[in-house]
Interface confidence: medium
Amino acid sequence: KRFHDVLGNERPSAYMREHNQLNGWSSDENDWNEKLYPVWKRGDMRWKNSWKGGRVQAVLTSDSPALVGSNITFAVNLIFPRCQKEDANGNIVYEKNCRNEAGLSADPYVYNWTAWSEDSDGENGTGQSHHNVFPDGKPFPHHPGWRRWNFIYVFHTLGQYFQKLGRCSVRVSVNTANVTLGPQLMEVTVYRRHGRAYVPIAQVKDVYVVTDQIPVFVTMFQKNDRNSSDETFLKDLPIMFDVLIHDPSHFLNYSTINYKWSFGDNTGLFVSTNHTVNHTYVLNGTFSLNLTVKAAAPGPCPPPPPPPRPSKPTPSLATTLKSYDSNTPGPAGDNPLELSRIPDENCQINRYGHFQATITIVEGILEVNIIQMTDVLMPVPWPESSLIDFVVTCQGSIPTEVCTIISDPTCEITQNTVCSPVDVDEMCLLTVRRTFNGSGTYCVNLTLGDDTSLALTSTLISVPDRDPASPLRMAN
């Protein structure tokens, strides 16, 4: 059998195989050692007994989408049946005091591979016995502690495979420079040691995407905005836009990145090299936010121009590729920074990302202030309590509710929260009366809210003993 017979039914075209060469991967035309690595079809009854105590599930994830030229990382994690885990030696053991359907196990091991390998690897001094090989016959790499790695992972995509010895979790990174744009399929088959052979325990597949667009996401934050995820924001308050570029392999780390913003409110275009920008909308309505991200990413170099004919010079190629600049001066000549174009030189190519959102701008409560606090005299039966009136003003829209949170002087331990609807006039002046149990210093958080906004002000107040002569003080 060949690898492609074992690993996948989807056969890439000859063109795909030729143009998607993955560095360090091998062609799936290679032979598969079925004696050491038996092949079971889906539904084969032997799968039921491939693992003691149930089935092992393999979970395959990737950090897709990947910008072409960057590295994409695949991670496979094995999930064992209940109560089983891998120990420090790579053996599979039962978790202590864990009860599954079979009850508590007397034997601590599900698979004691340490014992197996001591028995079976004695035939030569190197430990490189005929069975310590991958499905294509290549020997296992002898990393320190390799004997504790008891799972063999075979990754398969684009007509190529990659073999890896590992524990219950492995990661493989692939450079996407030669990968065709669009969705691709990665398949992984996992085997476990079984004496002097191997047994398949899991198969999993996942789609990954290679793109020539920079993957871009924008988070938006605005003070006083009640719900930051509904893309509704308040007029006359700055919104902070933060651009997140999905670049897990740090491919763009050395790129100059430009962010070009159009806020849709006729304020023109704004170009920045900073991933955050603040913008204030001064009108209500619906606006189309557009962002173009541009980066010079490492990319293929253009072919060197042919040597000029003696009669007239050949103009050089007009292209969006840029020669990668080095920190060393260029060769002498009339260009102080001329950089030669050699075939394997690292060049730069413009890459773009786009983000679009429709945001709604509405009136909201912009600001809230406590302008006065008055101690209200209490009748004699409540000598320990103080009533305090807070006179509050606000700017912006008219609030419909008020909440006060009374807490300790550090503003961390809440003692009392009271919310109530309010009916406020156009001037936005209201009085909020609250009770304080006993003297001392309190932190008061006062929020005014409506459907779309929530404005906060805080103050520390000092409530005196119930001596009528003691004045109420703002502690801050």
């Epitope: 170009v271 292209t319 260009n335 920074l337």
Partner: antibody, heavy 122, light 106 residues
Framework: QVQLVQSGAEVKKPGASVKVSCKAS????????MGWVKQRPGQGLEWIGA????????NYNQNFKGRVTMTVDTSISTAYMELSRLRSDDSAVYFC???????????????WGQGTLVTVSS | EIVLTQSPSSLSASVGDRVTITCSAS?????MHWYQQKSGTAPKLLIY???NLASGVPSRFSGSGSGTDFTFTISSLQPEDAATYYC?????????FGGGTKLEIK
């Protein structure tokens, strides 16, 4: 050799517009950003903005935003800088300068045009 | 924007002197460039990326520094070095220039 040749001096009235050109030769025009710099008589240098000729991606200094427009014509390797709503303090020499590849911070303006004097006077 | 403060704003030195100009950035930058401008002409790049000599520029010119403090040095002043010298940063938009140092020969 690399050369940047700018258009001639201009005299404009306040409120008018001026368009300065910068013709590049001796290198691949689309390989480098083209920046524009203002210098008032006896004063220092002020960066106006830059354009990437490969795709006309522009970047303007906020001080000039809304009044400046940078364009290119790649067929004749020429960059243009248009300044509108001219004021008396726009009287200055305007230089075009070739920036490093893709606006890289490693390379400042390595080649400069000879400058174009713009006089704004009523 | 990043403000570049150049000092001194002017200086007078004799032929053969060692001349040093400093440029301080309001926040940290990766690369500083230095230009020479003679009266009525365009600026000319002398030093790029802090310490690299542009081609055709005599080796008596040098640059150094990092972060916020950068230095430009002429090791042995020549009569043709009389000019105004500018530091500049292309690291952060808008690109900015120092106020200039006018160098006269005594």
């Amino acid at each position: 050799q690399v050369q940047l040749v700018q258009s001639g001096a201009e005299v404009k009235k306040p409120g008018a517009s001026v368009k300065v050109s910068c013709k590049a030769s001796g290198y691949t025009f689309t390989d480098n950003w083209m920046g524009w710099v203002k210098q008032r008589p006896g004063q220092g240098l002020e960066w106006i903005g830059a354009i990437d000729p490969s795709d006309s991606f522009t970047n303007y200094n906020q001080n000039f935003k809304g009044r400046v427009t940078m364009t290119v014509d790649t067929s004749i390797s020429t960059a243009y800088m248009e300044l509108s709503r001219l004021r008396s303090d726009d009287s200055a020499v305007y230089f075009c300068t070739r920036s490093g590849y893709y606006g890289s911070p490693k390379l400042g303006g390595d080649y400069w045009g000879q400058g174009t004097l713009v006089t704004v006077s009523s | 924007e990043i403000v570049l403060t150049q000092s001194p704003s002017s200086l007078s030195a004799s032929v053969g002197d060692r001349v040093t100009i400093t440029c301080s950035a309001s926040s940290s930058i990766s690369y500083m460039h230095w230009y020479q401008q003679k009266s009525g002409t365009a600026p000319k790049l002398l030093i790029y990326s802090t310490s690299n000599l542009a081609s055709g520029v005599p080796s008596r010119f040098s640059g150094s520094g990092s972060g916020t403090d950068f230095t430009f040095t002429i090791s042995s002043l020549q009569p043709e070095d009389a000019a105004t010298y500018y530091c500049a940063q292309w690291n952060s938009y808008p690109c900015t220039f120092g106020g200039g140092t006018k160098l006269e020969i005594k």
